[in-house]
C-alpha cells in the first residue's frame, strides 16, 4: 500500500476547520475490515484518531477530529480537524496498514490575521518640531509572530529607535506593540505595517502630524 499526502503545509485559520489530506490506493476486493488507519502526532506518536478492525475508534485528540467514513473504502484517509487552535500546529502522520503498510507526514501551519493597528502618541499635545515623541503601533490576536515595519511619509524605512514586543495570550495568539521614538519635523506621516508572514497579510496604521494639532488619517 502506498500513502500519499500533500507535500505543502496545510494552512488553517484559528477557529476554522482543516482537512489533512491522506489517500491510499485500495486493491480490488478491499474491505474496511482489513484496514488499519492511524493518525498520530509525528514527533511524539501520540494517537490522534484511528480506524482499525473495521471500526472508527474515535478522536483521541480533544474530540475535535473526524474521518470521512463514507470515503474510506475509496482510499480517502483524510482527517478533519475542527476549530483549529494554535496548539494544533505541527506534523501529523497518516499510517495505513492493509497487508503491508506505509505512512506519510503532513504539516499543519496555523495562522490568524492581525487586527488593523491602532496608533498612539506620547505626548499627544503641544507638539513642536524638534520634540521627541513616542509613537506606538498596536495590533492584536495574530499568529504566528508578526514582522513590523515603520516608514516615514516618503516611504523611507525607519529602523533606528524601534522597539517591538510580542506577547502571546492564553490562546497562543500574539498581541504586537511596536514603539518608534522620533524627533518631529515640521510635519510628517509615520506609518507602521504589521505583516503576518504565513498569510502574507499586511495591516497598516499611520499617524500624520501637520503643524498643530496632530491628526490621525481616517481608516481605510
Amino acid at each position: 500500500v502506498e500513502v500519499q499526502v500533500s507535500e505543502d503545509p496545510v494552512v488553517a485559520l484559528v477557529d476554522t476547520d482543516a482537512t489533512l489530506r491522506c489517500s491510499f490506493s485500495p486493491e480490488p476486493g478491499f474491505s474496511l475490515a482489513q484496514l488499519n488507519l492511524i493518525w498520530q502526532l509525528t514527533d511524539t506518536k501520540q494517537l490522534v484518531h484511528s480506524f482499525t478492525e473495521g471500526r472508527d475508534q474515535g478522536s483521541a485528540y480533544s474530540n475535535r477530529t473526524a474521518l470521512f467514513p463514507d470515503l474510506l473504502v475509496q482510499g480517502n484517509a483524510s482527517l478533519r480537524l475542527q476549530r483549529v487552535r494554535v496548539t494544533d500546529e505541527g506534523s501529523y502522520t497518516c499510517f495505513v496498514s492493509i497487508q503491508d503498510f506505509d505512512s506519510a507526514a503532513v504539516s499543519l501551519q496555523v495562522a490568524a490575521p492581525y487586527s488593523k493597528p491602532s496608533m498612539t502618541l506620547e505626548p499627544n499635545k503641544d507638539l513642536r518640531p524638534g520634540n521627541m515623541v513616542t509613537i506606538t503601533c498596536s495590533s492584536y490576536q495574530g499568529y504566528p509572530e508578526a514582522e513590523v515595519f515603520w516608514k516615514d511619509g516618503q516611504g523611507v524605512p525607519l529602523t533606528g529607535n524601534v522597539t517591538t514586543s510580542q506577547m502571546a495570550n492564553e490562546r497562543g495568539l500574539f498581541d504586537v506593540h511596536s514603539v518608534l521614538r522620533v524627533v518631529l519635523g515640521a510635519n510628517g506621516t509615520y506609518s507602521c505595517l504589521v505583516r503576518n508572514p504565513v498569510l502574507q497579510q499586511d495591516a497598516h496604521g499611520s499617524v500624520t502630524i501637520t503643524g498643530q494639532p496632530l491628526t490621525f488619517p481616517p481608516e481605510a
Epitope: 488499519n36 506518536k45 494517537l47 482499525t52 478492525e53 475508534q57 478522536s59 474530540n63 496498514s97 503498510f101
Partner: antibody
Framework: QVQLVQSGAEVVKPGASVKVSCKAS????????MHWVRQAPGQGLEWMGM????????NYNERFKTRVTITVDKSTSTAYMELSSLRSEDTAVYYC??????????WGQGTLVTVSS | DIQLTQSPSFLSASVGDRVTITCSAS?????MYWYQQKPGKSPKLLIY???NLASGVPSRFSGSGSGTEYTLTISSLQPEDFATYYC?????????FGQGTKLEIK
C-alpha cells in the same frame, strides 16, 4: 490460539518504578491495539492506556499520563508497561489485553504489583 | 470522561433465575461491551457491539440497549455464572468501565 503471557509478581518500594511485560502469541502482534488495565484489590477495572505495535501510536489515560510509558518490542511480540513514582495506592493487578473490535477480547493472566516499604 | 454506572452493584439470585444488569452512561455511547470476571481470574469478554455474543459464550447471555442505557441479561442462571460483571465503552477516551455488579448465589 491467542495467548498473552505476563511477567511475574513484583514487590517494589514507594517512589520506585515497575516494568511489566506481556508476550503475545497466536496472532499477528502488529495488527492489534494492546491495552493495559489495572485492578486494585477488591476494586473495579481501570484503563491505563494502549499502543498500536505497528505504528507505535499510543494513548494514555490522563490520570496516568505523567507516570506511565507503554512500549513494544516487535521483534519479540512483547508489550511493556512501565509505571513510575509508585505509591501504595498503585498496588494492583496489572493486565495487558488485546483489542477485538472496540473491546478488549483477550487478556493476560495479570501481574500483581505490590508497593510496600 | 464518560462515567458508566451499573445497577445493581450486588445481586442475589438462584440457579434458573432470569437476571438483568443495567449500565447507564453519562453521555451517549455507540456500543457497549460486557465482561465476566471470577475471583482470581482475568476478565472475559461476553458481549461486544452491545448485542453480539463473543466466541464460546453461551446463548443464555444477551445484551441490548442504545444511547445511554444498556442491559446484560442472563436468561437462566447457571452455577458457573456467579461472578462479577463489568460494562465498558470505547466511544470516547479514556476507555471506561462500570464499577461492577457482583452476582451472588441466594
Amino acid at each position: 490460539q491467542v495467548q498473552l503471557v505476563q511477567s511475574g509478581a513484583e514487590v517494589v518500594k514507594p517512589g520506585a518504578s515497575v516494568k511489566v511485560s506481556c508476550k503475545a502469541s497466536g496472532y499477528t502482534f502488529t495488527n492489534y491495539w494492546m491495552h493495559w488495565v489495572r485492578q486494585a484489590p477488591g476494586q473495579g477495572l481501570e484503563w491505563m492506556g494502549m499502543i498500536h505495535p505497528n505504528s507505535g501510536a499510543f494513548n494514555y489515560n490522563e490520570r496516568f499520563k505523567t507516570r506511565v510509558t507503554i512500549t513494544v518490542d516487535k521483534s519479540t511480540s512483547t508489550a511493556y508497561m512501565e509505571l513510575s513514582s509508585l505509591r501504595s495506592e498503585d498496588t494492583a493487578v496489572y493486565y495487558c489485553a488485546r483489542s477485538t473490535a472496540l473491546a478488549t477480547g483477550y487478556w493476560g493472566q495479570g501481574t500483581l504489583v505490590t508497593v510496600s516499604s | 470522561d464518560i462515567q458508566l454506572t451499573q445497577s445493581p452493584s450486588f445481586l442475589s439470585a438462584s440457579v434458573g433465575d432470569r437476571v438483568t444488569i443495567t449500565c447507564s452512561a453519562s453521555s451517549s455511547v455507540s456500543y457497549m461491551y460486557w465482561y465476566q470476571q471470577k475471583p482470581g481470574k482475568s476478565p472475559k469478554l461476553l458481549i461486544y457491539d452491545t448485542s453480539n455474543l463473543a466466541s464460546g459464550v453461551p446463548s443464555r447471555f444477551s445484551g441490548s440497549g442504545s444511547g445511554t442505557e444498556y442491559t446484560l441479561t442472563i436468561s437462566s442462571l447457571q452455577p458457573e455464572d456467579f461472578a462479577t460483571y463489568y460494562c465498558q465503552q470505547w466511544s470516547s477516551y479514556p476507555l471506561t468501565f462500570g464499577q461492577g455488579t457482583k452476582l451472588e448465589i441466594k
